[in-house]
């Protein structure tokens, strides 16, 4: 595979060629990690330390800000508890979601005392409203972690907030919660490592199962410690967890606890020369590529190795049909702490645990009506035995011989002359962005990856912690501890001044228009457009 980028641009070169706009942060803020993209309003909302920003998608230099610090009393209490005044005793924004047409919902660590509020953004973009609802603060417990170092995954739908977070001061009680709304909070089982075992939450997504909204599920992506007996020694496993949107908890032992929670391992590995697979287990980020069928997005996952000796990163793709197959497969079971995990062979109670109450798959109306045997089984069998393997059983991108690791991913589906291509933008822990195109070979899922560009987007090497892609603006937005960067998805002119160079680049965004390498638009009826992504063959396409 060609691991040398077609273009390698330093931060200086990016600046000089007007290919990056940076917001270098405020003196009294940092941690620009929480992104919310609003294409309709043409805004990027960013949660940071003591601040929430509203950036103009056209140019992030144009922004509004809300200052939301903690009180001096709260900060002092945090300091007295032995916390770091700068790195911990502040309000680090961890949740930033659209609540309704006029408001956002935001939660922060609140100097180890999580707090949430609403942000008014007005009905229309031209209202130019961006202000904190000072009169309405809510307890942020179970929504934001106490500790800013901890990751949170959240999703706000129909006025209810799903959060994967730590619900305690010590950062030990990890759970997947549903709060807000009119119902009692619901959570995963406490004190049971089979449900969650020191998880690091990555993201949460709503995915429809059928045309009936009653079947909708919320999927959580996270990594966690492997449970004893699942692996020899201490290991991390990447996971996908599911919860039915209409799960209102059970009865008996699962009152106000999820009854439909199930999790499965995500495998991203390559066969080793000695017959032992090299596993990329540290899930770092997930991107769902929705096209045609919203019920079946393609899941892109960014993984790194757990080993300190062997450092590597990979991107794996998963299909939702494979995920669903695993959740319909055997449950993981063991008879005691010293036993191995085996596929459960006994009778699975009806309705099958993990099934949503609906007219589609069964005749029961509520999770509160589930029979006792279903509740008992669900409580003790939260994990599936089979893992989810990636499409084509291997990663589509692997990087092992470099001094960086992948941290983030966004993907754009691009129409080219010879078909559609997925272009990946991969963020790294040294502040670079890799632009990679997957090119189908014999079958659409048997892919070749071509590294198009490697761009340094921050002045100092800093880990990229957030990324959003605007198809409307054709821009990429990147967050880190230091600030926010904006860059166009394509820099066609930089590929060169000749048709051959443009064609060899194999960038789906670009084509030779007869006089320059420029943005390719499938609608433009120009016979002179030269582009060959699949083969990158200039001989066939360039007459010069």
């Amino acid at each position: 595979k060609n691991n040398v980028p077609r273009l390698k641009l330093s931060y200086k070169e990016m600046l000089e060629s007007n290919n990056v706009i940076t917001f270098n942060g405020l003196a009294n803020s940092s941690s620009y990690h929480t992104f919310l993209l609003d294409e309709e309003r043409s805004r990027l909302y960013v949660g940071a330390k003591d601040h929430i920003f509203s950036f103009d998608l056209v140019n992030i230099k144009d922004f509004q800000k809300i200052v939301w610090p903690v009180s001096y009393t709260r900060r002092d209490e945090c300091k007295w508890a032995g916390k770091d005044i700068l790195k911990e005793c502040a309000n680090f924004i961890k949740v930033l979601k659209a609540y309704n047409q006029t408001h956002l919902y935001a939660c922060g660590t609140g100097a180890f005392h999580p707090i949430c509020t609403y942000i008014e953004i007005g009905h229309h973009p031209e209202d130019n409203i961006f202000k904190l609802e000072n009169s309405h603060f809510e307890n942020g417990r179970g929504k934001s972690p106490y500790d800013p170092k901890l990751l949170t995954a959240s999703l706000l739908i129909d006025g209810e907030l799903y959060s994967g977070t730590a619900a305690d001061f010590m950062g030990r009680d990890f759970a997947i919660f549903r709060t807000l709304g009119h119902h009692h909070p619901i959570r995963t089982e406490q004190h049971d490592s089979r449900w969650l075992n020191d998880p690091k939450f990555i993201s949460a997504h709503l995915i429809s199962e059928s045309d009936n909204p009653e079947d909708d599920k919320v999927y959580f992506f996270f990594r966690e410690n492997a449970i004893d007996g699942e692996h020899s020694g201490k290991a991390t496993h990447a996971r996908i967890g599911q919860i039915c949107k209409n799960d209102f908890g059970g009865h008996r032992s699962l009152v106000n606890k999820w009854t439909t929670f199930l999790k499965a391992r995500l495998i991203c590995s390559v066969p080793g020369p000695n017959g032992i697979d090299t596993h990329f287990d540290e899930l770092q980020d997930v991107f769902l590529m929705n096209f045609k069928d919203p019920k079946n997005p393609v899941v892109y996952g960014v993984f790194t190795t757990s080993s300190n000796i062997f450092k590597g990163s990979a991107v794996c793709m998963y299909s939702m049909s494979d995920v669903r197959r695993v959740f319909l497969g055997p449950y993981a079971h063991r008879d005691g702490p010293n036993y191995q995990w085996v596929p459960y062979q006994g009778r699975v109670p009806y309705p099958r645990p993990g099934t949503c109450p609906s007219k589609t798959f069964g005749g029961f109306d509520s999770t509160k009506d589930l029979p006792d045997d279903v509740i008992t089984f669900a409580r003790s069998h939260p994990a599936m035995y089979n893992p989810v393997f990636p499409m084509n059983n291997r990663p589509i991108v692997i990087k092992t011989d470099v001094n960086y690791q992948f941290t983030q991913i966004v993907v754009d589906r691009v129409d080219a002359e010879d078909g559609q291509y997925d272009v990946m933008f991969i963020g790294t822990d040294v502040g670079t962005v890799l632009k990679v195109v997957s090119i189908p070979k014999e079958t659409w899922y048997d892919l070749e990856e071509v590294l198009l560009e490697e761009m340094t987007v921050f002045r100092e090497p800093t880990a990229i912690s957030a990324m959003e892609l605007s198809t409307k603006q054709q821009q990429l937005y990147i967050g880190s501890t230091a600030g926010v960067a904006q860059l166009p998805l394509h820099r066609c002119d930089i590929y060169g001044k000749a048709c051959a160079e443009c064609c060899l680049a194999r960038d789906p965004y670009c084509a030779w228009d007869g006089s320059a390498c420029s943005r390719y638009f499938p609608t433009a009826k120009r016979a002179t457009r030269a582009q060959d992504i699949r083969n990158g063959d200039p001989l066939t396409h360039c007459s010069d």
Partner: antibody
Framework: EVQLLESGGGLVQPGGSLRLSCAAS????????MNWVRQAPGKGLEWVSG????????DYADSVKGRFTISRDNSKNTLYLQMNSLRAEDTAVYYC????????????????WGQGTLVTVSS | QSVLTQPPSVSGAPGQRVTISCTGS?????????VHWYQQLPGTAPKLLIY???NRPSGVPDRFSGSKSGTSASLAITGLQAEDEADYYC???????????FGGGTKLTVLG
């Protein structure tokens, strides 16, 4: 009706051992987290140990760690506390208590208590 | 020395209102954790009186109420009756080491 009945208390010499039992009835014992809480004569309450429904989580107060062992037998609806290397300061009434988790935030409360069993450690 | 601080004793005449305070820190009550209250009548086991800061289990008279603010909580008893004479304990979650914490207890004396 929920009932918790402790037994096994008595007089023991310092360094000795004792095993307390708590027989539960009137509720699904295997669904609940259980605890031992003690009260020294004329003093306040002190949480001693807790165990989850499936024994997957077990925790102890620092004062008893390494000396006391909590366990349960769901088939017998019974909670146990094995107390070794007993000290004079372990003298107390030992209560068996059920975790209710009644509140919105699932913070542990003790919704039912047994009548307690007295453990006296003296030479 | 208990982690949660309560006054050792309070007293009041029948029909009066008394309050018992419970002060913690930013790592227990102040961390947003719920406070629960127990009543221990002489010679008996403790009984859950208030859970989740202000909720009464069934059977507990509405003369008993709880509240919480910041790092403190309080139990209020109105229309004091002779049978209310007991020890009252507050309790909060604390996370590991220890898992839960209790107040030192407050002896309520009903005068007369």
């Amino acid at each position: 009706e929920v009932q918790l009945l402790e037994s096994g208390g008595g007089l023991v010499q310092p360094g000795g051992s004792l095993r307390l039992s708590c027989a539960a009835s009137g509720f699904d014992f295997d669904s609940y987290e259980m605890n031992w809480v003690r009260q020294a004569p004329g003093k306040g309450l002190e949480w001693v140990s807790g165990i989850s429904w499936n024994s997957g989580w077990i925790d102890y107060a620092d004062s008893v760690k390494g000396r006391f062992t909590i366990s349960r037998d769901n088939s017998k609806n019974t909670l146990y506390l094995q107390m070794n290397s007993l000290r004079a300061e372990d003298t107390a009434v030992y209560y068996c208590a059920r975790s209710g988790y009644s509140s919105s935030w699932f913070d542990p409360d003790f919704d039912y208590w047994g009548q307690g069993t007295l453990v006296t450690v003296s030479s | 020395q208990s982690v949660l601080t309560q006054p050792p004793s309070v007293s009041g005449a029948p029909g009066q209102r008394v309050t018992i305070s419970c002060t913690g820190s930013s790592s227990n009550i102040g961390a947003g954790y719920d406070v629960h209250w127990y009543q221990q009548l002489p010679g008996t086991a403790p009984k859950l009186l208030i859970y989740g800061n202000s909720n009464r289990p069934s059977g507990v008279p509405d003369r008993f109420s709880g509240s919480k603010s910041g790092t403190s909580a309080s139990l209020a008893i109105t229309g004091l009756q002779a049978e209310d004479e007991a020890d009252y304990y507050c309790q909060s979650y604390a996370g590991p080491n220890p898992y839960v914490v209790f107040g030192g207890g407050t002896k309520l004396t009903v005068l007369g």
